[in-house]
Interface confidence: medium
């Protein structure tokens, strides 16, 4: 109804004697905002309708106190009692220690103004502590993981519990092999007040059968336990046995197969048979209970390997472990395998010897070109430095104790080396000569791979006509050496080859060893002829004077040079090849002025009046620079020109007239001249 | 290229002995088998002794062992076969070979002289 009070709290709570129960509780009262005047736990209550009051024994009372009107009413103790709650909502309780006889009804009356509640609480207290509930799944499965719940429904503060796991008596902790976790949890609450533990492990098929118990402890003291078994379903267990393991080719061998444990049991024993995993057919199979029998009776080297067998339940398929069977024979044919290959020439080779064998091979034979190379009876053949002549093909025979394999395949080892023996080879006539077409061509002696290509140096100093042939179109006097390379992956170069072209001798000129300065008259005077270059060295020197020939050699002396010693001289420079001339080269002989004389123009007979011109005349080198002209007694006329004008003539200047000449080198002086002045008509017309 | 040059042979005694000399030149691999082998007329041409360039290593066919010795002079590129014992059988055109291996009819993929002769007379 309307005035009802809401009261929650466990239907039944569990203990036993000693221990202590905690009741959780919550309440409302019909009135929203009302709050617990009065608390009284009453137990064995009974309603007197008489005085309509509850009687019985009171284990709590706690009333609000009219001093403090807000004061609260929990954590108040009385007795064995402790009221945990408040005057709103909260009527938690714990009765510590509880007693066998606390069992039945309890009753929680409360007060709030006007409002009033009894409610019943039913306890189940035991003299001693009761087992643990073990809760687990309906199958569990070898390896599967399975959790097992232990839990007992008691929780009280002040009373802790522990509980344990053990598995055939050792106890089972988190670091348990195959256990994945163990974890603990308390729950008190309203609805239920419970302490659990759950154990989840992946359980083993030898686990099949073990017990599994589940203890109560409380101060290391053991409170109760409850224990199980396990009833691990798994696959069948089977156990293979090989008699002989390792047999020789057509030998037989049996192979059992026995079914040592299932569960379920099997309904039929039917035995698989693999081999290197795949199923095995058409095989000799004795069934009997519980086993199966594999006979093999003319081994050949195929059956080697790996077996195991098979058997089902309901769970599936179970496998024994695998057994290999070793079968013996000889070596099988061989073959080579060669690395690198190609091989470059000194690098390391290595070869090796390919043939199944059982037991593997002890002992090799190795064949180049199919002959035996004694010493070497390993599987590999290490060449430390291959070179050309380890080339070609390679083959071996493998041995064992049961006898000696076939060969079966050869391998080639290739050895690729740069040209060997490269050489430029000049196909023209020789001596070479200047302005000449030459041939060269590029030769070698071997290679492999074969070349490919070939390299001239220097760089575009002719034309290819064909690989390997190169043409220099006009070779020059000064060409260089020509070197060719013969290339496959690799280029060799060959030595320079020389081409030693013939020409005239170069740079011909005139050169003066004598006198160091100027040239003067009658001094000695050597002049040398050089060139530069000549090929062939062997040369002849001719020196020519204003076109024609003077003489033969290399120098040219003068003893004592005289001006008509002047001239335009060259030297010229033969050798077998031909002649160059030098350009032409000027002897300068330098002299004091000579041969001076006095010429009169237009005559020596003048008449007077009219003009003369004396010319001094002379043959000097460097030219006069200085000219002076006297008359018949020796004076200075103080003129200093070539030329001396007279103008207008008189008859007083008749007489001899002399001119001095002077250069860098001296002075010259003329013989007299003389000049005549007669008289004119008209003179002698007066007189 | 390779040039091998045989000298020594001659005729000799049974139980005498002969030293056989081998000049090679042109040989440009550091490894390698420099021997000698012998044929008679009318037979097959067969292995006698050999040795390995690298490693001095030496081979002898059974029918030479104990009275043959090969031996090398490095600094003059000479190889010398020391006969001891000599039989009759023993005469053949001896040949000096090189080549990449030691084998028993020889040297593989040889290169090898004219040879020279040995005698043994009885």
């Known amino acids: 109804s309307a005035n009802d009070w809401t009261v929650d709290h466990p239907q039944t709570l569990f203990a036993w004697e000693g221990a202590c129960i905690r009741i959780p509780c919550k309440y409302k009262t019909p009135l929203p905002k009302a709050r617990l005047d009065n608390i009284l736990l009453f137990q064995n209550y009974e309603f007197d309708k008489a005085t309509k009051k509850f009687t019985g024994t009171v284990l709590y009372n706690a009333t609000k106190t009219e001093k403090d009107p807000e004061s609260e009413l929990y954590l108040s103790k009385q007795g064995r009692v402790t009221f945990l709650g408040n005057r709103i909502d909260n009527c938690t309780l714990k009765i510590h220690p509880i007693r066998a006889n606390d069992s039945g009804n309890l009753g929680l009356r409360m007060t709030a103004g006007t409002e009033r509640w009894m409610e019943p609480i039913h306890l189940n207290v035991s003299e001693k502590p009761f087992q643990p509930y073990i809760q687990m799944p309906s199958e569990i499965r070898e390896s599967q993981s399975v959790t097992l719940t232990c839990g007992l429904n008691f929780s009280c503060f002040g009373y802790d519990i522990l509980l344990k796991w053990f598995l055939e008596d050792s106890e089972i902790t988190s670091i348990t092999s195959s256990v994945t976790s163990i974890t603990s949890s308390v729950t008190s609450s309203i609805k239920n007040v419970y302490t659990e533990s759950k154990l989840t492990f992946q359980p083993k098929w030898t686990d099949h059968g073990k017990s599994v118990k589940c203890q109560v402890q409380h101060s290391s003291k053991v409170l109760s336990e409850r224990t199980v078994r396990l009833d691990v379903k798994y696959t069948p267990k089977l156990e293979i046995k090989v008699n002989p393991t390792e047999v020789e080719k057509n030998n037989s061998v049996t192979m059992t197969c026995r079914v040592n444990s299932s569960n379920p049991k099997l309904r039929t024993v039917a035995v698989s048979w693999f081999k290197d995993g795949r199923p095995l057919e058409d095989q000799e199979l004795e069934q009997e209970q519980q086993m199966s029998k594999l006979i093999l009776h003319s081994v050949t080297k195929d059956m080697r390997g790996k077996y195991r067998c098979q058997a089902s339940n309901d769970i599936g398929p179970g496998e024994s472990e695998e057994v290999e069977l070793t079968v013996h024979y000889a070596p099988e044919p061989s073959r080579v395998h060669i690395y690198p290959s190609p091989a470059e020439e000194g690098q390391s080779v290595e070869l090796i010897c390919e043939s199944l064998a059982s037991p593997s091979a002890t002992n090799y034979t190795w064949y180049h070109n199919r002959k035996p190379i004694p010493g070497d009876t390993q599987e590999k053949l290490r060449i430390p430095k291959v070179s050309p002549w380890h080339a070609g093909n390679y083959s071996c025979l493998a041995e064992n104790r049961l006898g000696h394999g076939k060969i079966d395949q050869e391998a080639k080892l290739d050895v690729h080396y740069a040209p060997k023996a490269v050489t430029t080879v000049i196909q023209s006539f020789t001596p070479i000569l200047e302005g000449d077409s030459v041939t060269l061509v590029c030769r070698y002696n071997s290679s492999n791979p074969d070349v490919t290509s070939y390299r001239w140096n220097p760089q575009g100093s002719g034309s290819v006509l064909k690989p390997g042939v190169l043409r220099i179109q006009k070779v020059t006097w000064d060409s260089m050496p020509v070197s060719c390379a013969a290339c496959n992956h690799k280029c060799s170069w060959a030595l320079p080859v020389i081409l030693n072209v013939h020409y005239a001798p170069r740079d011909v000129k005139v050169l003066k060893v004598s006198p160091a300065s100027e040239i003067r008259a009658g001094q000695r005077v050597l002049l040398q002829c050089d060139f530069a270059e000549s090929n062939p060295a062997e040369v002849r020197f001719f020196w020519k004077k204003n076109g024609s020939l003077v003489q033969e050699g290399r120098y040219l002396s003068f003893g004592s040079v005289s001006p008509e010693d002047s001239g335009n001289y060259n030297c010229m420079v033969n050798n077998s090849i031909g002649e160059t001339l030098s350009q032409a080269w000027n002897l300068q002989v330098l002299y004091a002025p000579r041969r001076l004389r006095v010429s009169i123009s237009p005559g020596d007979h003048v008449m007077e009046g009219k003009k003369a011109t004396l010319s001094c005349e002379s043959d000097a080198n460097p030219p006069i620079s200085q000219y002076t002209w006297f008359d018949s007694s020796g004076q200075d006329l103080h003129s200093s020109g070539q030329k001396l004008r007279l103008e207008p003539l008189e008859v007083q200047h008749t007489g001899s007239y002399r001119c001095k000449g002077t250069n860098g080198i001296g002075t010259g002086e003329s013989p007299p001249s003389t000049l005549t002045v007669y008289y004119s008509p008209e003179t002698i017309g007066k007189r | 290229q390779v040039q091998l040059v045989e000298s020594g042979g001659g005729l000799v005694q049974a139980g005498g002995s002969l030293r056989l000399s081998c000049a090679a030149s042109?040989?440009?691999?550091?490894?390698?088998?420099i021997g000698w082998f012998r044929q008679a007329p009318g037979k097959e041409r067969e292995g006698v002794s050999c040795m390995y360039s690298s490693d001095g290593s030496t081979y002898y066919a059974d029918s030479v062992k104990g009275r043959f010795t090969i031996s090398r002079d490095n600094a003059k590129n000479t190889v010398y076969l020391q006969m001891n014992s000599l039989r009759p059988e023993d005469t053949a055109v001896y040949h000096c070979?090189?080549?990449?291996?030691?084998?028993?009819?020889?040297?593989?993929?040889?290169?090898w002289g004219q040879g020279t002769q040995v005698t043994v007379s009885s």
């Open positions: 070979a090189a080549g990449p291996w030691c084998f028993v009819t020889g040297v593989g993929r040889e290169e």
């Open positions: 042109g040989i440009t691999s550091d490894d390698y088998a």
